[in-house]
């Protein structure tokens, strides 16, 4: 057989954040190359990352076609320089990935506070509505467009002079909170999908504080 020195891929792992989705696997190739195929449960296999020596393959373009579909990938191993060779059963060696449903499983990326504006004893904090690679009608959808009411944001805020944090939640991208006049506050936000069982929360955004150089109004 031509596959004497060929080993099957293993540890196939989906790495996905805000629908940017990469399949990773092992081992680093020695005298072999890989090709990846992806399919939905009821669809045909589509080949990607042909005869690559990488151990990752960006499958974003495929999964963003429908983020509620469940996808399966498989990684084929071929001898380097002899990609026509097959295993003893007439097939190249391959390994299947776990199933992956982007809507349920993609990690939420770190959000960014776009701006904050104080009027009297109220502060309006706006979270940037991050663009994803999911398209509809030739336009890229934002995270809010994709997740709709499944997505909320949690705001953590505290006086610059103390460590006691308060929280607020919104199912839009804006918060309106009460603050003490004359006090500076710091803010951090987190994206949350409360009804998820895995990957429910993003990491916290960078902290932004009132009275710093960036000022209260930022584009």
């Amino acid at each position: 057989s031509g596959t004497t020195n060929t080993v099957a891929a293993y540890n196939l792992t989906w790495k996905s954040t805000n629908f940017k989705t990469i399949l990773e696997w092992e081992p680093k190739p020695v005298n072999q190359v890989y090709t990846v195929q992806i399919s939905t449960k009821s669809g045909d296999w589509k080949s990607k990352c042909f005869y690559t020596t990488d151990t990752e393959c960006d499958l974003t373009d495929e999964i963003v076609k429908d983020v509620k579909q469940t996808y399966l990938a498989r990684v084929f191993s071929y001898p380097a320089g002899n990609v026509e060779s097959t295993g003893s059963a007439g097939e190249p060696l391959y390994e299947n990935s776990p199933e992956f449903t982007p809507y349920l499983e993609t990690n939420l990326g770190q959000p960014t506070i776009q701006s904050f504006e104080q009027v009297g004893t109220k502060v309006n904090v706006t979270v940037e509505d991050e663009r994803t690679l999911v398209r509809r009608n030739n336009t890229f959808l934002s995270l809010r467009d994709v997740f709709g009411k499944d997505l909320i944001y949690t705001l953590y805020y505290w006086k610059s002079s103390s460590s006691g944090k308060k929280t607020a939640k919104t199912n839009t991208n804006e918060f309106l909170i009460d603050v003490d006049k004359g006090e500076n506050y710091c803010f951090s936000v987190q994206a949350v999908i409360p009804s998820r069982t895995v990957n429910r929360k993003s990491t916290d955004s960078p902290v932004e504080c009132m009275g710093q150089e960036k000022g209260e109004f930022r584009e």
């Epitope: 939905t40 449960k41 509620k68 579909q69 809507y103 349920l104 409360p194 009804s195």
Partner: antibody, heavy 118, light 107 residues
Framework: EVQLVQSGAEVKKPGASVKVSCKAS????????MNWVRQAPGQGLEWMGE????????TYNQKFKARVTMTVDQSTSTVYMELSSLRSEDTAVYYC???????????WGQGTTVTVSS | SIQMTQSPSSLSASVGDRVTITCKAS??????IAWYQQKPGKSPKLLIY???NRYTGVPSRFSGSGYGTDFTFTISSLQPEDIATYYC?????????FGGGTKVEIK
């Protein structure tokens, strides 16, 4: 264990109002939208609207918008659906249903029969 | 609103038979389809979501497929406990709408 327990059967006269309750337990109440779906005798399912238990914000089916009000009591993990100006065609079983991630209704109450009769 | 047309409205099959129900949406709903089972006098029960994903604890004989406007629900081998009415529902665009139901009986 997730449970949605609804209030008992009601008999109402045309023109009256009815308020049905749905008490949730076994999960984070504010993390899931609660929907109301009704089913007339021998008929199919009809979505009436939903409420966000975290904010109290609601979205109604246009067909019921003028007559339905959904409210929430976070302290008792209970949502309410009030339907006013009842008519005979409102005779139905009314279900509360928890909306799962992405839209489907994963858990349903046992149903409350509302009979509208003069 | 999106209309969901389900067929047939009723069917009769023998135990062990393969049963297929179809649902057609009046416009594309991507894969935003769920299927429910309702037994007489009981609340509906979610079987399939996102067109093809089995909900927790649902037996493997139940499956769903389709995309866009045309969807299929299949019971691979009908069991006596499957006697019920089955509904499709689109959860793609509010107001969420249901098909008219398919009553499944045993011959």
């Amino acid at each position: 264990e997730v449970q949605l327990v609804q209030s008992g059967a009601e008999v109402k006269k045309p023109g009256a109002s009815v308020k049905v309750s749905c008490k949730a337990s076994g999960y984070s109440f504010t993390g899931y939208y609660m929907n109301w779906v009704r089913q007339a005798p021998g008929q199919g399912l009809e979505w009436m609207g939903e409420i966000n238990p975290s904010t109290g914000g609601s979205t109604y089916n246009q067909k019921f918008k003028a007559r339905v009000t959904m409210t929430v009591d976070q302290s008792t993990s209970t949502v309410y659906m009030e339907l006013s100006s009842l008519r005979s065609e409102d005779t139905a079983v009314y279900y509360c249903a928890r909306r799962e991630l992405g839209g489907p209704f994963g858990y349903w109450g046992q149903g409350t029969t509302v009979t509208v009769s003069s | 609103s999106i209309q969901m047309t389900q067929s047939p409205s009723s069917l009769s099959a023998s135990v062990g038979d393969r049963v297929t129900i179809t649902c057609k949406a009046s416009q594309s709903v991507s894969s935003g389809i769920a299927w429910y089972q309702q037994k007489p006098g009981k609340s509906p029960k979610l079987l399939i979501y996102f067109a093809s994903n089995r909900y927790t604890g649902v037996p493997s004989r139940f499956s769903g497929s389709g995309y866009g406007t045309d969807f299929t629900f299949t019971i691979s081998s009908l069991q006596p406990e499957d006697i019920a009415t089955y509904y499709c529902q689109q959860d793609y665009s509010s107001p969420w709408t249901f098909g008219g139901g398919t009553k499944v009986e045993i011959k």
